[in-house]
């Protein structure tokens, strides 16, 4: 699987999950989150050659089409597969509130 | 929705479904399919700016990150959303066989 275990410990050039730290204030302009100040969101990047973790029949077709038509603009793209939530703390007045923001962290990628 | 109805009738520059015809022999190297000779597979293409048909919380975060960090390599990607099957006819000896190939046609796209 193109997950953090594999991708972070390899020099994989094809589609894989990459490290990305997002600072809530600086990168998103969100000042209201108290904790954490930022988080490891990660992102998906890399080419999707034929057979590389292809998601559907269609992505297999497109990768095969690409093999026969190099330089075509139609190609599968490396996108998130498994996403995880992020717990945050923010204040409502003086009262801290804990909430889960769903689908915030990329754990693995696929070619779609 | 970024579907064929909208995208084929507009000059949309952002993520949208685009027309692509695939010839089984020429583009995939498949000689064994009797009918059809090819089909309109379509493909997804175009940038994914903030708020443009974003798929998950994560893709919203990434688009926002991109807005704050122009030129960053982390960005949402335009990929298939709705896929449809394709019926094909091939011969097993002299006997025709009809089969559905699942997820072969792109009907709409999303930013993921």
């Amino acid at each position: 699987a193109l997950d953090t275990n594999y991708c972070f410990s390899s020099t994989e050039k094809n589609c894989c999950v990459r490290q990305l730290y997002i600072d809530f204030r600086k990168d998103l302009g969100w000042k209201w989150i108290h904790e954490p100040k930022g988080y490891h969101a990660n992102f998906c990047l890399g080419p999707c050659p034929y057979i590389w973790s292809l998601d559907t029949q269609y992505s297999k077709v497109l990768a095969l089409y690409n093999q026969h038509n190099p330089g075509a603009s139609a190609a599968p793209c490396c996108v998130p597969q498994a996403l995880e939530p992020l717990p945050i703390v923010y204040y409502v007045g003086r009262k801290p509130k804990v909430e889960q923001l769903s689908n915030m962290i990329v754990r693995s990628c696929k070619c779609s | 929705a970024l579907d064929t109805n909208y995208c084929f009738s507009s000059t949309e520059k952002n993520c949208c479904v685009r027309q692509l015809y695939i010839d089984f022999r020429k583009d995939l190297g498949w000689k064994w399919i009797h009918e059809p000779k090819g089909y309109h597979a379509n493909f997804c293409l175009g940038p994914c700016p903030y708020i443009w048909s974003l798929d998950t919380q994560y893709s919203k975060v990434l688009a926002l990150y991109n807005q704050h960090n122009p030129g960053a390599s982390a960005a949402p990607c335009c990929v298939p959303q709705a896929l449809e099957p394709l019926p094909i006819v091939y011969y097993v000896g002299r006997k025709p066989k009809v089969e559905q190939l699942s997820n072969m046609i792109v009907r709409s796209c999303k930013c993921s």
Epitope: - | G29, G93, K95
Partner: antibody
């Protein structure tokens, strides 16, 4: 160059199942039908069935229907043939063989080295 | 199922001989203007090797001394001048009907 490398010899008891693998290299695995053919000791060739790796479409010889399952793993370009409820007359060399690509049923241009399956109590 | 009958089942020949093997199908294997008949060579302990496809087409890399002919139900494999490496068993195969079937084989031995 095209190569089909099969798993090693197996000894099985009657009633058991066997799963033979065939790893393909040197060509686009998902674009050609993969056939399975067997040959009992000193006998001729018998076609068991085939699979198209792209879609998983299969055509089985009726003689094996219900006892055989052909599958593929496209991520490793490997084809598998599982035969269940083994009998002593299933003792044979099992070959995977690539169809030449013009039709589903076709001539076969590349063959694996064969896997001997012995069924004995 | 289409039955494939090869003859002879075995033959003895010498290097340089012209050898002819025949294959008869229980029904015509012709359609779409092609004869769906193929020939293979198999040596002991080895996998079969494709020699001729669609009755008369020589597979790439196969010596030109091998040739195939025929249509309908009757087909022939000819080796124009037998070489030492040609001693093997030869099989015909049809793919006009499901299931694909093979002939019983013809063993070519050294005289």
């Amino acid at each position: 160059q095209v190569q089909l490398v099969q798993s090693g010899a197996e000894v099985k008891k009657p009633g058991a199942s066997v799963k033979v693998s065939c790893k393909a290299s040197g060509y686009t695995f998902t674009s050609y039908w993969m056939n399975w053919v067997r040959q009992a000791p000193g006998q001729g060739l018998e076609w068991m069935g085939q699979i198209f790796p792209f879609s998983g479409s299969t055509n089985y010889n009726e003689m094996f229907e219900g006892r055989v399952t052909m599958t593929t793993d496209t991520s490793t370009s490997t084809a598998y043939m599982e035969l269940r409820s083994l009998r002593s007359d299933d003792t044979a060399v099992y070959y995977c063989a690539r169809g030449i690509g013009n039709y589903a049923l076709d001539a076969m241009d590349y063959w694996g080295q064969g896997t001997l399956v012995t069924v004995s109590s | 199922d289409i039955q494939m009958t090869q003859s002879p089942s075995s033959l003895s020949a010498s290097v340089g001989d012209r050898v002819t093997i025949t294959c008869r199908a229980s029904e015509s294997v012709d359609f779409w203007g092609n004869s769906f008949m193929h020939w293979y060579q198999q040596k002991p302990g080895k996998a079969p090797k494709l020699l001729i496809y669609l009755a008369s087409n020589l597979e790439s890399g196969v010596p030109s001394r091998f040739s195939g002919s025929g249509s309908g139900t009757d087909f022939t494999l000819t080796i124009s001048s037998l070489q030492p490496e040609d001693f093997a068993t030869y099989y015909c195969q049809q793919n006009a009907e499901d299931p694909l079937t093979f002939g019983g084989g013809t063993k070519v031995e050294i005289k």
